[in-house]
């Protein structure tokens, strides 16, 4: 060995400078008499090496790093050999931090596998290996004096949290318990803790379990859940409280905790809860009144909530048929009577006669908003309730009564847009209860059992804006009939457009006769169409060679027009304009020519 | 200092019935779970049942399954076997225990004989 | 159920002896083993429970091991008032099963 490093440290804190003497052994003879020593750190040549020759031949040369900045390097003592640099010797040098004090040190006790995990954090990177050790000891007292000391728990490399086994624990005793961090810089201790392995017990979760339905047991309330809870086995000697979490499966909703419960539920009852929805229920306990940790959250037990019977008032509306007027067509709308008014399955019709309790005859039963039946002569009166599997709603009467009300007069309509229209009346005397209001398509398209219906509760309404099934170009029929305590008014009828369409087309011009001065024109008129206005009027346009335009409004009936004042020999554009409320259409240019000074007339 | 007193054995004809009484102190009755253990003459120890602190859990083994009902009074710190149906083989000194947080019955009576015989 | 297995079912040693008595669960219980020692007319008191903790006012000459299915109560030192029966028991579940008891009697 030619040369030999030696370092005032190998391992420094980083950023602190750093001393290394190289020296050269006389008997290198190969060596230049006078070599000069380099230095280079990785692969920078460091400048700054003082040089000498000692007193026994040998050749030294010190070099102070002033900062050390690199977590690892690696220091060269060189010579210039030829075109190359020899590295005589090489040390390594490493810089990094004493450890900090771990933080945040807690532990827990696993009954099952009986033993005392305690974890930390470490803090921040040291950039040198840095060994952590879990230290504790057995404590009679509040850990002031120190009793057995337990064998040290060393981490595998790179985890921050030990397991003290079950051989080292005494349960309801006190130990000391810290982490001590130690690498070449220094070593440092987290604060101690002091506990009993039983006051940090972290439990298993109970397992949800749904109530199996007993005969005897009444099924649970609407928006309730019946369920209970398995406790673990091993913990079921430890007093515990425990709380329960819920949420609808569907939706964005978070958790709502109810607690505390005990941890033996033979059975509960969770209600308030929506109806008819599925939740997601899962549990967790902790170790109570003494002290502990809470256990996870058990798996989740998914349930569905029973629906409630509807609540809803049902708005009802009939017609008989004008054949057979035993034959009656019942319409009928839901109307929510609470936020949820729980969900319908169906509809039932029925009747009972009179004379025979307990005897309830079906109509109908339908998922649909009407239904058609044949009414026993006897029955003046059906019930009809919506239901679900939870129930039915109350009855709604429906009295099939003579129409003896008042009247009310004055029905109109107008549109409002094109996709409403307002009907309006002058109430009869006395007030009716409310109305009834019908509307679909006027001839030739009317059909009855297209007809949407809408119930006006307020009798001293004097009109309904209509927004439902409205299109624009379209003739609606509007029947509006008042409805008295125990029968109704004649119904009132009026028809009317949200919107008309301008004419479609304008009628062809045809020439009847030609003069030098003057041209007869005439038309055939379009047929009227449904969904248009009827014309208000035409403008007939006519412009010469010299581009000047001329017009003439005529009335709706006209047929023809004879165009005065032309010149002769001369050529003109005349086009026809139909025109009604909703706007107006030209129809296709005539171009004709007067005839010449000497010419005859034409007829 | 716990102590158990066990009350309520004695002599008693097959198909009778008895009632066992434990009195509890010198601890939180309300918070431990208790049960009762019997060991027939020159026999080992059987476990016979065992009540959770406020009542609502109740194991029982299954030779007095149907037959006895354990149950408690928190007010009164006082535990009770109720024994019907009894048999020849139910007769056993019949230990009061107190169990601790991990199942072990950690203080023990003095026991109370219970002989059936006609 | 959980069947404990004690054993032996007797032994006979003298004062300063290591005693050593096996428990064996039919199935794993963790730690759940408690060991007892009962006198001829008195009940039973706790030595020993969750396998290997000291019951307070028990003397350290008594000592617990083993876990999952395999249990040993040792004496380190036989005493004269140690001549007695011992008992294991489950608490991992219920049934609580006691094992079929240990007599140490004097050589």
């Known amino acids: 060995e030619c040369g030999h490093i030696s370092v005032s440290a190998p391992i420094v804190h980083l950023g602190d400078p750093i001393t290394a003497s190289c020296i050269i052994k006389q008997n290198c003879s190969h060596l230049d008499p006078e070599p000069q020593i380099l230095w280079r750190l990785g692969a920078e040549l460091q400048p700054g090496g003082r040089q000498q020759r000692l007193s026994d031949g040998t050749q030294e040369s010190i070099i102070t790093l002033p900062h050390l900045n690199h977590t690892q390097a690696f220091l060269s003592c060189c010579l210039n050999w030829g075109n190359s640099l020899q590295i005589l010797d090489q040390v390594e040098l490493r810089a990094g931090y004493p450890p900090a004090i771990p933080h945040n040190l807690s532990c827990l006790m696993n009954l099952t596998t009986s033993s005392l995990i305690c974890q930390w954090e470490p803090g921040p990177e040291t950039h040198l290996p840095t060994s952590f050790t879990l230290k504790s000891f057995k404590s009679r007292g509040n850990c002031q004096t120190q009793g057995d000391s337990i064998l040290d728990c060393v981490p595998k490399d790179g985890q921050s949290h030990c397991c003290i086994p079950r051989k080292h624990l005494l349960l309801y005793q006190n130990m000391g318990i810290w982490v001590q961090a130690e690498n070449a810089l220094g070593t440092s201790m987290s604060p101690q803790l002091c506990l009993d392995p039983m006051d940090v017990v972290k439990l298993e979760p109970p397992m949800l379990r749904t109530m199996d339905p007993s005969p005897e047991a009444a099924p649970p309330q609407a928006g309730c859940l019946q369920l209970c809870w398995e406790p673990w086995q091993p913990g079921l000697h430890i007093n515990q409280k425990c709380e329960l979490r819920h949420k609808p499966q569907r939706g964005e909703a978070s958790w709502a905790l109810v607690g505390p419960l005990p941890l033996e539920a033979l059975q509960y009852e969770l209600c308030g809860l929506l109806p008819a929805t599925a939740y997601t229920l899962q549990i967790r306990c902790i170790r109570w009144p003494l002290p502990g940790h809470w256990s996870d959250w058990s798996p989740s037990l998914e349930l569905r909530t029973t629906e409630r019977a509807p609540t809803v008032r049902l708005d009802t509306w009939w017609r008989q048929r004008q054949l057979d007027p035993r034959t009656v067509q019942l319409f009928w709308k839901p109307v929510p009577l609470e936020e949820d008014s729980g969900r319908i399955q169906g509809y039932v019709v029925s009747w009972r006669p009179s004379g025979q309790a307990g005897a309830i005859l079906p109509l109908c039963n339908t998922t649909e908003l009407s239904c058609t039946f044949h009414l026993p002569s006897e029955a003046q009166e059906v019930a009809l309730v919506a239901y679900n599997s939870a129930g039915t709603s109350r009855p709604t009467p429906v009295v099939f009564s003579e129409s003896r009300g008042p009247a009310l007069t004055r029905l109109h309509a107008m549109a409002r847009d094109p996709h409403s229209l307002w009907v309006g009346w002058e109430p009869p005397n006395p007030w009716p209860q409310g109305y009834v209001i019908e509307w679909g398509l006027g001839p030739p398209s009317a059909s009855n059992s297209n007809k949407t219906w809408r119930m006006e509760q307020n009798g001293r309404a004097t009109g309904f804006l209509l927004k439902e099934n409205i299109r624009p170009f379209q003739l609606y029929e509007i029947i509006v009939t008042p409805l008295y305590q125990d029968t109704m008014g004649p119904s009132q009828h009026v028809y009317a457009y949200s919107q008309e369409m301008a004419p479609s087309h304008a009628p062809e011009l045809h020439l009847k006769h030609i003069g030098k001065t003057w041209a007869q024109l005439e038309w055939v008129p379009e047929p009227p169409e449904l969904g248009k206005s009827p014309l208000t009027h035409y403008t007939i346009f006519w412009t010469n060679a010299q581009n000047q335009s001329f017009s003439a409004i005529l009335n709706a009936s006209s047929r023809g027009f004879v165009l005065h004042g032309l010149e002769p020999a001369s050529l003109y554009h005349i086009h026809l304009m139909a025109a009604s409320q909703a706007g107006a259409t030209n129809s296709t240019v005539l171009t004709l020519m007067t005839l010449t000074p000497e010419g005859s007339e034409l007829h | 200092e716990v102590q158990l007193l066990e009350s309520g054995g004695g002599l008693v004809q097959p198909g009778g019935s008895l009632r066992l009484s434990c009195a509890a102190s010198?601890?939180?009755?309300?918070?431990?779970?208790m049960g009762w253990v019997r060991q027939a003459p020159g026999k080992g120890l059987e476990w016979v049942s065992s009540i959770s602190s406020s009542g609502g859990v109740t194991p029982y083994a299954d030779s007095v399954k149907g037959r006895f009902t354990i149950s408690r009074d928190n007010s009164k710190n006082t535990l009770y076997l109720q024994m019907n149906s009894l048999r020849a083989e139910d007769t056993a000194v019949y230990y009061c225990?107190?169990?601790?947080?991990?199942?072990?019955?950690?203080?023990w009576g003095q026991g109370t004989l219970v002989t059936v015989s006609s | 159920d959980i069947q404990m297995t004690q054993s032996p079912s007797s032994l006979s040693a003298s004062v300063g002896d290591r005693v050593t008595i096996t428990c064996r669960a039919s199935q794993g219980i963790s730690s759940y083993l408690n060991w007892y020692q009962q006198k001829p007319g008195k009940a039973p008191k706790l030595l020993i429970y969750?396998?290997?903790n000291l019951q307070n006012g028990v003397p350290s000459r008594f000592s617990g091991s083993g876990s999952g299915t395999d249990f040993t109560l040792t004496i380190s030192s036989l005493q004269p008032e140690d001549f007695a029966t011992y008992y294991c028991?489950?608490?991992?579940?219920?049934?609580?099963?006691f094992g079929g008891g240990t007599k140490v009697e004097i050589k």
């Open positions: 225990a107190k169990l601790g947080e991990l199942g072990q019955s950690s203080a």
């Open positions: 010198g601890f939180t009755f309300s918070l431990y779970w």
């Open positions: 028991q489950q608490s991992i579940q219920y049934p609580q099963m």
């Open positions: 969750y396998a290997s």
